[in-house]
């Protein structure tokens, strides 16, 4: 069964800067990755970035830099100020559309006890939805 993992990290140098890393553990071909915050994409969440394997990357503030790390994992640096700044309990979600498995999404947030610069290991997060 495919799985999606999500890792959220707050940068020690900039407390309003977060790095989100997501990966897809499956054998299929990824056709699109959508990163959102505030909940799952399409269920109250706000899209931060869309990564298409062929067409490129579209990102929305406060996303600063989205990139593919491998063929099945991505990272996104977020930095905000004021109303658009993420906070420690913000939920970030990654949705991977793949063939033939379909869409798989998982969410994560900063571990409750984490210090800036630390993060939980990138273990598979609970799968919220499989379309």
């Amino acid at each position: 069964t495919p799985e999606v993992w999500v890792q959220v990290r707050m940068e020690a140098t900039e407390l309003s800067s977060f790095t989100i890393r997501c990966g897809f553990l499956g054998s299929g071909s990824i056709s699109l990755v959508t990163v959102s915050w505030g909940g799952p994409n399409g269920a109250g969440g706000t899209t931060l970035a869309v990564l298409h394997p062929e067409r490129g990357i579209r990102q929305w503030a406060p996303a600063r830099q989205a990139r593919w790390e491998t063929q099945s994992s991505i990272s996104l640096i977020l930095e905000g100020s004021g109303a658009s700044s993420p906070c420690a309990n913000t939920t970030f979600c990654c949705k991977f559309a793949s063939f033939p498995e379909g869409s798989w999404e998982a969410c994560g947030s900063l571990p409750p006890s984490s210090d800036p610069g630390l993060s939980a290991p990138p273990t598979p997060a609970p799968i919220l939805r499989a379309d």
């Epitope: 298409h52 062929e54 490129g56 990357i57 996303a63 990139r67």
Partner: antibody, heavy 120, light 113 residues
């Protein structure tokens, strides 16, 4: 044949607003994002933002957020850009440009440009 | 934002000569997913709009003469005009189409001697 026909030149006073139009023809308007780009002597080409004509979703260069508003009229296949609180620094040629089908932000067709001059 | 730097700012060549211009990006434009470089080149003739010549660093847009050759990877890119013609008098701009916001270089002006 794909064509993007922009409205004519504008001479406006500082503090005023202006609305530029870009009428698309020769393709299905809602199938391609529309980008807006500014060209001035000092700053070469600068991306202002984009709009998805299908649903009106927009995305901006943070530098132009609050300066530009992007809209579309699907019935006439026309994209619009409103520029507000104009200053002399906003004097430039403004282009609409269609995003190509191969990649985000590779712009395969451009309008002829609309010259905006801000002067008292 | 990704910063694009072009050089030289201008050059003057005779018809038939080979022209090369450079474009450098402040971060890699190579996707780790598909190994494509998200770099485009545009030509802007005097009084005209920009015209897409090349995207993905080396893919020529339909209808563009094969004397226009895009190359490079990562952060360093080159546009070559193998045998420059009088009608190639123009400004040439590189642009990253890797991610939002797309950014342009300052341009290279090609003049014909």
């Amino acid at each position: 044949e794909v064509q993007l026909q922009q409205s004519g030149p504008e001479l406006v006073k500082p503090g005023a607003s202006v609305k530029i139009s870009c009428k698309a023809s020769g393709y299905t308007f809602t199938d391609y994002y529309m980008n807006w780009v500014r060209q001035s002597h000092e700053k070469s080409l600068e991306w202002i933002g984009e709009i998805n004509p299908n649903n009106g979703d927009t995305n901006f260069n943070q530098k132009f957020k609050g300066k530009a508003t992007l809209t579309v009229d699907k019935s006439s296949s026309t994209a619009f850009m409103d520029l507000r609180s104009l200053t002399s620094k906003d004097s430039a040629v403004y282009y609409c440009a269609r995003e190509g089908g191969s990649s985000y932000y590779a712009m395969d067709y451009w309008g002829q440009g609309t010259s905006v001059t801000v002067s008292s | 934002d990704i910063v694009m730097t072009q050089s030289p700012s201008s050059l003057a060549m005779s018809v038939g000569q080979k022209v090369t211009m450079s474009c450098k990006s402040s971060q890699s434009l190579l996707s780790n997913n598909n190994q494509k470089n998200f770099l485009a080149w545009y030509q802007q003739k005097p009084g005209q709009s920009p015209k897409l010549l090349v995207y993905f660093a080396s893919t020529r847009e339909s209808g563009v003469p094969d004397r226009f050759i895009g190359s490079g990877s990562g952060t360093d890119f080159t546009l070559t005009i193998s045998s420059v013609q009088a009608e190639d008098l123009a400004d040439y701009f590189c642009q990253q189409h890797y991610s939002t916001p797309p950014t342009f270089g300052g341009g290279t002006k090609v003049e014909i001697k």
